[in-house]
Interface confidence: medium
């Protein structure tokens, strides 16, 4: 808390400029008008204020806007955003994607902080759903963002947003999350032709049911082994040897090395030995 002291004569700030870096903390408090600061927030980032000076500026804004900052100020916070607490951010109403981008840019290259997580939560709740543009923005800054959401939160993702998802965005998703995302992806890509469809749906197949895998096996897709290893065990178990052979195409050779790993191990145990022998891989059920 900074003590209230009168501003020395001639030091009253007329605008936010470089001269303020020479002000002591108490001088900033006394000589910078909070309303002036709010209207010239965009200038703060160009001035090399110390962390302590930024604390004073934040304090002034907090006093001016006890109920939370308006978006016109939030959009220009820049490095002052790093001074905000999740409690501060919970008071905000952020509706503009430009504001979100501006603040994510400040945190770029760092792990997702509690502040950023709170900001995103406020933004998404304000919009009511994770639309494509938002998802595009969030996954560009945080590739793992999608997989940080609960299955319940993912259920609010509209199928149209799935077009923004890149394979690496799903790297850390668990089966429960893919169970939610897969039907949306299937809907989003339903009008694509066979090979194009497979390229798009491939990353989501960890949520695919048996009937969809059977359908894919009829389409000459040559699923790669890395994708096969991520399929749900319960979806793989009912597949016949012939279906798995069609599904994997030339990649079926890789099954031998994975015979001790799920889902291959459990699938092998469900097959007749005569059928396994047709693969010529020496798999033992």
């Amino acid at each position: 808390e900074v003590e209230k002291t009168a501003c020395p004569s001639g030091k009253k700030a007329r605008e936010i400029d470089e001269s303020l870096i020479f002000y002591k903390k108490w001088e900033l408090e006394a000589c910078v008008d909070a309303a002036l600061l709010a209207t010239q927030m965009d200038r703060v980032n160009a001035i090399p204020f110390t962390y302590e000076q930024l604390d004073v500026l934040k304090h002034k804004l907090d006093e001016l806007y006890p109920q939370g900052y308006p978006e016109s100020v939030i959009q220009h916070l820049g490095y002052l955003f790093l001074k905000m607490s999740p409690e501060d951010i919970r008071k905000w109403n952020v509706t503009s994607l430009e504001t979100l981008k501006a603040l994510l840019e400040v945190n770029k290259g760092h792990e997702m902080s509690p502040q950023v997580a709170t900001l995103i939560d406020r933004f998404v709740k304000g919009r009511g759903q994770l639309d494509k543009d938002t998802l595009d923005t969030l996954t560009a800054f945080y590739p793992g963002y999608l997989c940080s959401l609960s299955p319940e939160e993912l259920s609010s993702v509209p199928p149209s947003s799935i077009w923004a998802v890149r394979p690496q965005d799903l790297d850390t998703c668990d089966p429960r999350q893919l169970d939610v995302l897969y039907p949306k992806a299937r809907l989003a890509f339903q009008n694509m032709n066979g090979s194009e469809y497979f390229v798009k749906i491939q990353s989501f197949l960890g949520g695919a049911p048996t009937e969809d895998l059977k359908a894919l096996s009829q389409q000459n897709v040559s699923m790669d082994l890395a994708t096969f290893m991520k399929l749900r065990t319960d979806a793989v178990l009912p597949l016949t040897v012939a279906e798995v052979q069609k599904l994997l195409g030339p990649h079926v050779e890789g099954l031998k090395a994975e015979e001790r790993h799920r889902p291959v191990r459990d699938w092998i145990l469900r097959q007749r030995q005569d059928d396994l022998d047709t693969l010529g891989l020496g798999l033992q059920g």
Epitope: D224, L225, H261
Partner: nanobody, 124 residues
Framework: EVQLVESGGGSVQAGGSLTLSCAAS?????MAWFRQAPGKAREGVAS????????TYADTVKGRFTISQDNAKNTLYLQMNSLQPEDAAMYHC????????????????????FGRGTQVTVSS
């Protein structure tokens, strides 16, 4: 689940060198390096077949990159010399239980596991 963790990426000037490492939680007969630049398809770089140590290289890296492994440590390496801007990409290691021939095809579809990758940046 098999874990693959790459390291050693970074920024380097054209003509410089880097050595990438990949620590694997389990071994397989075939280990390889793949790379993917933004907006481009994944491309095979080099592979090594553990039982006899035979190696395969993509034409674009022959004579500049060397793949090797330490079987005792389940670690794969990629020594990259004379790096060029076009070598900049995310480098992923991959393992699979493949035959000698298939290992040499350098096709991603045959591999069961891929690591998350390590970024290599080359400035001219």
């Amino acid at each position: 689940e098999v874990q693959l963790v790459e390291s050693g990426g970074g920024s380097v000037q054209a003509g410089g060198s880097l050595t990438l490492s990949c620590a694997a939680s389990e071994s397989r007969d075939c280990m390889a390096w793949f790379r993917q630049a933004p907006g481009k398809a994944r491309e095979g770089v080099a592979s090594i077949y553990a039982p006899d140590g035979s190696t395969t290289y993509a034409d674009t890296v022959k004579g500049r990159f060397t793949i090797s492994q330490d079987n005792a440590k389940n670690t794969l390496y990629l020594q990259m010399n004379s790096l060029q801007p076009e070598d900049a990409a995310m480098y992923h290691c991959a393992i699979g239980g493949l035959s000698r021939n298939t290992c040499g095809y350098l096709r991603g579809g045959y591999f069961a596991y891929f690591g998350r990758g390590t970024q290599v940046t080359v400035s001219s």
